[in-house]
Interface confidence: medium
């Protein structure tokens, strides 16, 4: 449905204040580092001139399309070479060239400080002076420093952040009121940020096909009892969402999840009985909700897949005349019967029948070749069965911050030459999954692990993909988006890798550790461990948990000593000569 | 990774003052420690001054001691040498350099180094 004037399209559409928030998310997320105060000022200029077209459609520039009109107004920018060097080349470029350049210019890991939160009555304050900034604010930081938050759901996070701050700033105690809630907020942030950020990389790096292949195989899972075609046109619609979003098209994107929403709950019946509560919703909760939702319960008569699938004379028939439709019914058939799998394992028990279909179809007797395929996908199967058994088991005996410590091990003892706050950062991360998956049942474990550890490792992926120094890291993470973990766990201690010189200082500790949060001392002594593992690969777990032990124990020592400063250089000494001699160094 | 990059440098009369600037990116300074160092014409690379990552523990080369400051602002991931009172054997090429969380007394303890600027003390 072609319209004269596509900025009045979604203005309308949208209404002004989700578009108001969707350009400003959209500026924010492709020149991260510009101030505030300069893209509130390009929002309104941009909602000023989408109200002249809405009243008029065929006024000046009113036909131009959306990359062309935000890409104008971002290259007016008048610091954008100093501030931004080459991307400022974009500037030259015709659409759909520069916007493709602007998206290549994202930032995963832009130079931005640290979000430091105010005391709870200076943000009641300001959220009271001014609501509207406040809450401005809020989007414009959170975008850039997430380039590819899923802007809809971002809107979603803005309105929770704003009914927190509209309840608890009138209660009696407000920190007990609010600071739970930012605390909730900004976890969940950040994992939605993860989540989309494998989206897109899946969209980008992988392609639609890979994307599709995804979507069939979760909301198969999602919405058993829906036929084949429904779950098509959903992928499909929701092929279209993320596609826009990873693309920077906001708008477009917002408006079509809105309308993606809309269809699912209009279709309720053909596609889920878990879907009541949410189609009750207003729009952002609703579509929050249908993204989270529970899958249904699995048709109770459904027949062996082995049937259509291998034990028919037609296999090779059907394959032929359309593979990707033949491939996505098999992804369909075994994901809908399997909600204990995580996405990944469907994918590649999809990715090994279709490698043996390609094989046996060109064979003498294919029927005798491929009759065993489903054979193949036993130790598929058991590998992440095994590996989650026994990695549950490890985190029930050491707890979250050790767990987290066996990992941050295993991993620089893989990729040694990743640097020292990333390695920490995302062992931290995969060390999180005991506490998220270990406290389900079996049939939920796997697919909260494994799709858990897909993010995380993409959010590795990423990082290192900007300043790239380990080949296993850059071979794992291209090869194939579904095998990443398995690469990953199958990596061995690095032999190629030159242990880092012994530097005494990196093991010595002030007095200031002693004020710092748990979650900052523990980063301080990870970071310290991951820097003795790059010293000493070879070193036993033995003794980097004797080590460990002592260096924890030191800590609380000089903690509690009335003279701090010299507890820790005194004792600071002894102990990093004992670990010396623990470890040989 | 961390990529460094140093600016501020120039001309500067004996007696006068300038202000070096180590600003990263590619990565957070928060869990680094950052340390200024200086190359003249013929001679040793030589540590002039380090910063821990807390901001905490700060120490000199005798011969800035009481002339040359450093600082850190986490928040803009940058960290500044202030100089003043500058002499000619001041001259050199300065460099930062990050290490993990604590200040190195080698050269060779530090991981990432910056590509230089030229300070010059002339009259």
């Known amino acids: 449905d072609a319209h004269k004037s596509e900025v009045a399209h979604r203005f309308k559409d949208l209404g002004e204040e989700n578009f108001k928030a969707l350009v400003l998310i959209a500026f924010a997320q492709y020149l991260q580092q510009c101030p505030f105060e300069d893209h509130v000022k390009l929002v309104n200029e941009v909602t000023e001139f989408a109200k002249t077209c809405v009243a008029d459609e065929s006024a000046e520039n009113c036909d131009k399309s959306l990359h062309t009109l935000f890409g104008d107004k971002l290259c007016t920018v008048a610091t954008l070479r100093e501030t931004y060097g080459e991307m400022a080349d974009c500037c030259a470029k015709q659409e759909p060239e520069r916007n493709e350049c602007f998206l290549q210019h994202k930032d995963d890991n832009p130079n931005l400080p640290r979000l430091v939160r105010p005391e709870v009555d200076v943000m009641c304050t300001a959220f009271h002076d001014n609501e509207e900034t406040f809450l401005k604010k809020y989007l414009y930081e959170i975008a850039r420093r997430h380039p590819y938050f899923y802007a809809p759901e971002l809107l979603f996070f803005a309105k929770r952040y704003k009914a927190a701050f509209t309840e608890c700033c009138q209660a009696a105690d407000k920190a007990a009121c609010l600071l739970p809630k930012l605390d909730e907020l900004r976890d969940e942030g950040k994992a939605s940020s993860a989540k989309q950020r494998l989206k897109c990389a899946s969209l980008q790096k992988f392609g639609e096909r890979a994307f599709k292949a995804w979507a069939v195989a979760r909301l198969s899972q999602r919405f058993p009892k829906a036929e084949f075609a429904e779950v098509s046109k959903l992928v499909t619609d929701l092929t279209k969402v993320h596609t826009e979003c990873c693309h920077g098209d906001l708008l477009e994107c917002a408006d079509d999840r809105a309308d993606l929403a809309k269809y699912i709950c209009e279709n309720q019946d053909s596609i889920s009985s878990k879907l009541k509560e949410c189609c009750e919703k207003p729009l952002l909760e609703k579509s929050h909700c249908i993204a989270e939702v529970e899958n249904d319960e699995m048709p109770a008569d459904l027949p062996s897949l082995a049937a259509d699938f291998v034990e028919s004379k037609d296999v090779c028939k059907n394959y032929a005349e359309a593979k990707d439709v033949f491939l996505g019914m098999f992804l369909y058939e075994y994901a809908r019967r399997h909600p204990d799998y995580s996405v990944v394992l469907l994918l590649r028990l999809a990715k090994t029948y279709e490698t043996t279909l390609e094989k046996c179809c060109a064979a003498a007797d294919p029927h005798e070749c491929y009759a065993k395929v489903f054979d193949e996908f036993k130790p598929l199967v058991e590998e992440p069965q095994n590996l989650i058994k026994q990695n549950c088991e490890l985190f029930e005996q050491l707890g979250e911050y050790k767990f987290q410590n066996a990992l941050l091990v295993r991993y620089t003892k893989k990729v040694p030459q990743v640097s020292t706050p990333t390695l920490v950062e995302v062992s931290r991360n995969l060390g999180k999954v005991g506490s998220k998956c270990c406290k389900h049942p079996e049939a939920k474990r796997m697919p909260c692990a494994e799709d858990y550890l897909s993010v995380v490792l993409n959010q590795l992926c990423v990082l290192h993909e900007k300043t790239p120094v380990s080949d296993r890291v850059t071979k794992c993470c291209t090869e194939s988006l579904v095998n990443r973990r398995p690469c990953f766990s199958a990596l061995e201690v690095d032999e190629t890798y030159v242990p880092k010189e012994f530097n005494a200082e990196t093991f010595t500790f002030h007095a200031d550790i002693c004020t710092l949060s748990e979650k900052e001392r523990q980063i301080k002594k990870q970071t310290a461990l991951v820097e003795l593992v790059k010293h000493k690969p070879k070193a036993t777990k033995e003794q980097l948990k004797a080590v460990m032990d002592d260096f924890a124990a030191f800590v609380e020592k000089c903690c509690k000593a009335d003279d701090k400063e010299t507890c820790f250089a005194e004792e600071g000494k002894k102990l990093v000569a004992a670990s010396q001699a623990a470890l040989g160094l | 990774e961390v990529q460094l990059l140093e600016s501020g440098g120039g001309l500067v009369q004996p007696g006068g003052s300038l202000r070096l600037s180590c600003a990263a990116s590619?990565?957070?300074?928060?869990?680094?420690?950052i340390g200024w160092f200086r190359q003249a014409p013929g001679k040793e690379r030589e540590g002039v001054s380090c910063?821990?990552?807390?901001?905490?523990?700060?120490n000199y080369a005798d011969s800035v001691k009481g002339r040359f400051t450093i600082s850190r602002d986490n928040s803009k991931n940058t960290v500044y040498l202030q100089m003043n009172s500058l002499k000619p054997e001041d001259t050199a090429v300065y460099y930062c350099?990050?290490?993990?969380?604590?200040?190195?007394?080698?050269?060779?303890?530090?991981?990432?180094w910056g590509q230089g600027t030229q300070v010059t003390v002339s009259s």
């Open positions: 590619g990565e957070t300074l928060d869990y680094y420690a």
């Open positions: 910063i821990a990552s807390s901001g905490g523990s700060t």
């Open positions: 350099a990050a290490a993990v969380l604590e200040c190195r007394t080698v050269v060779r303890g530090y991981d990432y």
